[in-house]
C-alpha cells in the first residue's frame, strides 16, 4: 500500500523560460532509517520519470540533462532540480519513493510548475563615456541566469569597430573603438537560450562624444537665397549697406561652443559673438576683413574664416566727396 | 488524438513464435512506457508488462517472464512484443496500452485495437 | 498480487432499472478504476479514481467504495449500456483486473 506526504511550500512555482528552478521536496519524516529505496519524479499523467537516481530506469528524453533529483535521504532531500525550462515543462509534477525490498512505497503531493516567457532582458553597461578613437569595454549581462544552466550565447551586433573581449556564464565584454560617424547608431546584444530555444536582445544608441570633424558658415544676404561655405575663403564680395547674417555651424559631440571673431584670433581672443549666428545689421568699412567662427570643444576646436570685401554704393561714395 | 495501432491477426503452429507490433501517434511516445496486456477467449485481462521507449528497459509479470519479450523502435514510435514457444493457451487477444499515471493513481487511459493470436495446428 | 473478485459474472436488467454491480479486493487499495468492454472492441476507460467518470461517459454511471470493496452503479439501464465491466487496481504491482461482470439488457 503507497503511502503518502505533503510537498512542503507553495502549490506551485513559476519559472521564466531559459533559466531554472528548485522544486523542494522533504523526505516525510516517518521514514524508518532502514528505508532504502529508489526516488523518482513523474510529470502528473506520464510513467516514464523525468529525473530518478534509479540506474534502471531511464528517463523522459525531454527532461533528460535538465531535470535532477537532488537526492540526500540523510538529510531528507528530495527535491527536483530544473534548468532550461521549456515552456512543454508547464506542468503537475510528483515524486515517488519506491523501494525493491519493501512491500510500500511514498507518493508526494502534486507541485505545479508554471513557465512563463522571459521577460528579463539583458543589460549593457558602458564605463564612463565613449571617445572616438579611444577603446572601451562595452558589458552585456545577464545576472538573472543560473550558473547550472546551458550556457547562453552572446552575440553582438554594431556598425563600429570592435573586438570580443572575455566571457562568462552570465556576460560577455566587447571592445569597442568607435569612430565619429558611429554616434548615435545601434548596438545590439543578443543572448540565445539554447537549451530552451529563447532570445531576447537589447539595443542602445551609442552616444559617442568627438570633437568637430567639420563647421561651415551660411551666409544669408538680404532676402536672397543663403549660401554656405564649407572651407576658408579668400573674399566675399558684399554690397555696402547690406543686412549680413553668418550662421556658424559644426558637428561633434556634445555640441561644440560656436563664437565669432573678427579677425584670426588669439586663443583667449574675445569674441564678438559667443553664438554661432553673427549679425551684421549694416556692412560698411568696419565689418571689411576677416571673420572667424571657432567651434570648440574638449576633445578639440576647428575654425573657419571668410574674408569680406565691402562694395561700395557709388552714390554714397560721391556724396561723401 | 492519442492512436495505438497494432498489427493484424496471426494464425501459427505450436512451437513457433511470432512477432507483434503496436505503432504509436498522437503523444510524445517517449514519455510513457508502453504497456501489453492479454484477453484470453471469454476471460478476463492479465497486464504482460511494459517497456521503457527510451532505454528499452522491461518490467514483467513473472507469469510471463520467458514467453513475452518486449522491445521497441524509438524511431517509428513503434513496440513489439514477441511471444515464443506458442501453445494453444497462448491463443488470445493481445493489447498494446498506454497507462496514466498519476500522483493519485494509474490506470490504462489508451488501448490499441488488440491483435488475435490463434495457436493451431 | 492483489485479486479482484467482481460479482455478480452476469447480470441483466431492463430499461430504467437501477442497476449495481461490485468488486471486491484482496487487500485494501486505494482507488478502483472500471473499464466498459463490448464483443470485438478493446476495453474503454470508464470510471477512474473509483468514482470519476471518463469523458463521454452517461451521468447515469457513478463508481464508490474504499479499502476493499467497490462499487459501480448504473442509475437507469439503458440498451447501450449492455457490456462487460471490469474492475483493475494499480496500487500495487502487478497491475490486475477483475474477471469482469456481463451485463445484458432483458
Known amino acids: 500500500q503507497e503511502r503518502r506526504f505533503q510537498l512542503e511550500g507553495p502549490e506551485s512555482l513559476t519559472v521564466q523560460e531559459g533559466l531554472c528552478v528548485l522544486v523542494p521536496c522533504r523526505l516525510p519524516t516517518t521514514l524508518p532509517a532502514s528505508y532504502y529505496g529508489y526516488g523518482y519524479w513523474f510529470l502528473e499523467g506520464a510513467d516514464v520519470p523525468v529525473a530518478t537516481n534509479d540506474p534502471d530506469e531511464e528517463v523522459q528524453e525531454e527532461t533528460r540533462g535538465r531535470f535532477h533529483l537532488l537526492w540526500d535521504p540523510r538529510r531528507k532531500n528530495c527535491s527536483l532540480s530544473i534548468r532550461d525550462a521549456r515552456r512543454r515543462d508547464n506542468a503537475a509534477y510528483f515524486f515517488r519513493l519506491k523501494s525493491k525490498w519493501m512491500k510500500y512505497g511514498y507518493t508526494s503531493s502534486k507541485l505545479s510548475v508554471r513557465v512563463m516567457a522571459l521577460t528579463h532582458r539583458p543589460n549593457i553597461s558602458i564605463p564612463g563615456t565613449l571617445e572616438s578613437g579611444h577603446p572601451s569595454n562595452l558589458t552585456c549581462s545577464v545576472p538573472w541566469v543560473c550558473e547550472q544552466g546551458t550556457p547562453p550565447i552572446f552575440s553582438w551586433m554594431s556598425a563600429a569597430p570592435t573586438s570580443l573581449g572575455p566571457r562568462t556564464t552570465q556576460s560577455s565584454v566587447l571592445t569597442i573603438t568607435p569612430r565619429p560617424q558611429d554616434h548615435s547608431t545601434n548596438l545590439t546584444c543578443q543572448v540565445t537560450f539554447p537549451g530552451a530555444g529563447v532570445t531576447m536582445e537589447r539595443t542602445i544608441q551609442l552616444n559617442v562624444s568627438y570633437a568637430p570633424q567639420k563647421v561651415a558658415i551660411s551666409i544669408f544676404q538680404g532676402n536672397s537665397a543663403a549660401f554656405k561655405i564649407l572651407q576658408n575663403t579668400s573674399s566675399l564680395p558684399v554690397l555696402e549697406g547690406q543686412a549680413l547674417r553668418l550662421l556658424c555651424d559644426a558637428d561633434g559631440n556634445p555640441p561644440a561652443h560656436l563664437s565669432w571673431f573678427q579677425g584670426f584670433p588669439a586663443l583667449n581672443a574675445t569674441p564678438i559673438s559667443n553664438t554661432g549666428v553673427l549679425e551684421l545689421p549694416q556692412v560698411g568699412s568696419a565689418e571689411e576683413g576677416d571673420f572667424t567662427c571657432r567651434a570648440q570643444h574638449p576633445l578639440g576646436s576647428l575654425q573657419i574664416s571668410l574674408s569680406l570685401f565691402v562694395h561700395w554704393k557709388p552714390e554714397g561714395r560721391a556724396g561723401g566727396v | 488524438e492519442v492512436q495505438l495501432q497494432q498489427s493484424g491477426p496471426e494464425l501459427v503452429k505450436p512451437g513457433a513464435s511470432v512477432k507483434m507490433s503496436c505503432k504509436a501517434s498522437?503523444?510524445?511516445?517517449?514519455?510513457?512506457?508502453m504497456h501489453w496486456v492479454k484477453q484470453s477467449h471469454g476471460k478476463s485481462l492479465e497486464w504482460i508488462g511494459n517497456?521503457?521507449?527510451?532505454?528499452?528497459?522491461?518490467s514483467y509479470n513473472q507469469k510471463f517472464k520467458g514467453k513475452a519479450t518486449l522491445t521497441v523502435n524509438k524511431s517509428s514510435s513503434t513496440a513489439y512484443m514477441e511471444l515464443r514457444s506458442l501453445t494453444s493457451e497462448d491463443s488470445a487477444v493481445y493489447y498494446c496500452?498506454?497507462?496514466?499515471?498519476?500522483?493519485?493513481?494509474?490506470?490504462?487511459?489508451?488501448w490499441g485495437q488488440g491483435t488475435t493470436l490463434t495457436v493451431s495446428s | 498480487q492483489i485479486v479482484l473478485t467482481q460479482s455478480p459474472a452476469i447480470m441483466s436488467a431492463s430499461p430504467g432499472e437501477k442497476v449495481t454491480m461490485t468488486c471486491s479486493v484482496s487487500s485494501s487499495v486505494s482507488y478502483m478504476h472500471w473499464y466498459q468492454q463490448k464483443s470485438g472492441t478493446s476495453p474503454k476507460r470508464w470510471i477512474y479514481d473509483t468514482s470519476k467518470l471518463a469523458s463521454g461517459v452517461p451521468a447515469r454511471f457513478s463508481g464508490s467504495g474504499s479499502g476493499t470493496s467497490y462499487s459501480l452503479t448504473i442509475s437507469s439501464m439503458e440498451a447501450e449500456d449492455a457490456a462487460t465491466y471490469y474492475c483493475q487496481q494499480w496500487s500495487s504491482n502487478p497491475p490486475t483486473f477483475g474477471a469482469g461482470t456481463k451485463l445484458e439488457l432483458k
Open positions: 496500452a498506454r497507462r496514466y499515471y498519476g500522483s493519485s493513481s494509474s490506470y490504462f487511459d489508451y
Open positions: 498522437g503523444y510524445t511516445f517517449t514519455d510513457y512506457k
Open positions: 517497456i521503457n521507449p527510451n532505454n528499452g528497459g522491461t
